[in-house]
């Protein structure tokens, strides 16, 4: 069920549960396994890191990608690997850490219209987009032509963050992906962990803005792993 999903996408400087109540026991929702958004339920605490087997990048955390652990290794055995930092070699965008993308085989810094991260993958589920007329019924197939003219504003349906205006990212919300504000300094963020399933992440926050990273709030270091509050902080 999704009872344990932490509904934390209200872009406000509020600790759970004030940021949302889906994480409360008795939250009135349930779902079939894999419903709507795959891959959000495979987190584990950083303190107890073990390689996590995967089939695709979406199954890994924001700071990871899915690949064979050894160069030229068995393609059938893939695990979540740490993302590659700027100027490191890459073969696809997902290999590069948030804020970067793969260009000519090297991870380079994203410009404002090319954010990436777990929430940036082209959505393969059956959800359309309505970024221009916003009537809810523009087709996905019209995306490329329309998006060159109009960038989605906050609340617009999107497929990827490049569909959204500057300062916004494309993040999941229920059965949709919509443009949400990129997080500012001090705002609560989601630090992705893999195991110890907390249900499907259907309430995504954006990533932290430029020059910020999602880190444990200093006064929460003593708290238990599960209750640590992460906020966007200066590098």
């Amino acid at each position: 069920t999704l009872n344990s999903v932490l509904n934390s996408n209200a872009i406000k400087n509020l600790p759970p549960p004030l940021g949302g109540a889906a994480g409360h026991p008795g939250s009135a929702v349930s779902a079939a396994p894999g419903i709507l958004y795959p891959g959000g339920n495979k987190y584990q605490t950083i303190d107890n890191y073990q390689p996590y087997p995967c089939a695709e990048d979406e199954e890994c955390g924001t700071d990871e990608y899915c690949a064979s652990p050894t160069r030229g290794g068995d393609a059938g055995v893939q695990i979540c690997l740490a993302c590659r930092k700027r100027r490191k070699r890459c073969m696809r965008h997902a290999m590069c850490c948030p804020g970067n993308y793969c260009k000519n085989g090297i991870c380079v810094s994203s410009d404002q219209n090319h954010f990436r991260g777990e929430i940036e993958e082209t959505i393969t589920e059956s959800f359309g987009n309505d970024h221009s007329t916003l009537d809810g019924y523009s087709r996905r197939t019209t995306l490329s032509s329309k998006m060159y003219h109009t960038k989605g504003q906050e609340g617009s349906v999107c497929l990827r963050s490049s569909d959204c205006a500057s300062g916004l990212c494309c993040a999941r919300h229920f059965w949709s992906k919509i443009c949400k504000p990129v997080l500012k300094e001090g705002q609560v963020c989601t630090k992705h962990r893999r195991k110890g399933s907390h249900g499907l992440e259907i309430f995504q926050r954006c990533y932290c803005g430029e020059g910020l990273s999602c880190r444990i709030q200093k006064d929460h270091h003593q708290a238990s792993n599960s209750s640590r509050l992460h906020t966007c902080q200066r590098h």
């Epitope: 209200a10 889906a22 809810g136 906050e154 919509i178």
Partner: antibody
Framework: EVQLLQSAAEVKRPGESLRISCKTS????????MHWVRQMPGKELEWMGV????????SYNQKFKGHVTISADKSSSTAYLQWSSLKASDAAMYYC??????????WGQGTLVTVSS | EIVMTQSPPTLSLSPGERVTLSCRAS??????LNWYQQKPGQAPRLLIY???RLHSGIPARFSGSGSGTDFTLTISSLQPEDFAVYYC?????????FGQGTKLEIK
């Protein structure tokens, strides 16, 4: 133009089974999620659940889980809401709604279900 | 689940008047609020989504505002066709929930 055409009103007895339908046209059925919403006489709207017609995945409001089943047939671009055993309290107007965003943009005209012994 | 409370339950006004309908959420829902209009014997119709975005085909006299827990739907100048029941809906937390509605009737 998006159109959602729901099946006709039904009069049933408690304990009977029922399946109501929502036939869609004007868009690609598998590209949008389909929701069912209940409205009891003189009451507010209640979200029952959602289906992704492309793969049959469903998510229910806990209040309705186990009592109703949402399904979809891609070949006929039709969504269904069904009960295996109706209760008197199931008497209501039922709407289907097709959408892309976290809002309900297009609605069927509604199917009135009467349950009376 | 999040409880949505609308006020007042009924409002009697004349065409041409400005009206403000209120909706309160039991907890912070950010901007995840939609407004619908329902006329007798008809299905609801989406007016406003994401707090203030006007749905296509909806007249500009409708507008939405607010944030957090308190939201308003404003109709700048009531037209005869605007008399109906208005529902707010939160889509911040599953399950999406609706308010009990505000009935707008002709004075």
């Amino acid at each position: 133009e998006v159109q959602l055409l729901q099946s006709a009103a039904e009069v049933k007895r408690p304990g009977e089974s029922l399946r109501i339908s929502c036939k869609t046209s004007g868009y690609t059925f598998t590209e949008y999620t389909m929701h069912w919403v209940r409205q009891m006489p003189g009451k507010e709207l209640e979200w029952m659940g959602v289906i992704d017609p492309s793969n049959g995945d469903t998510s229910y409001n806990q209040k309705f889980k186990g009592h109703v089943t949402i399904s979809a047939d891609k070949s006929s671009s039709t969504a269904y809401l069904q009960w295996s055993s109706l209760k008197a309290s199931d008497a209501a107007m039922y709407y289907c709604s097709s959408t892309t965003g976290p809002w309900f943009a297009s609605w069927g005209q509604g199917t009135l279900v009467t349950v009376s012994s | 689940e999040i409880v949505m409370t609308q006020s007042p339950p009924t409002l009697s006004l004349s065409p041409g008047e400005r009206v403000t309908l209120s909706c309160r959420a039991s907890q912070d829902i950010s901007n995840y609020l939609n407004w619908y209009q329902q006329k007798p014997g008809q299905a609801p119709r989406l007016l406003i989504y994401y707090k203030s975005r006007l749905h296509s085909g909806i007249p500009a006299r409708f507008s939405g505002s607010g944030s957090g827990t308190d939201f308003t739907l404003t109709i700048s100048s009531l037209q005869p066709e605007d008399f109906a029941v208005y529902y707010c809906q939160q889509v911040h937390t599953l399950p999406p929930t609706f308010g009990q509605g505000t009935k707008l009737e002709i004075k």
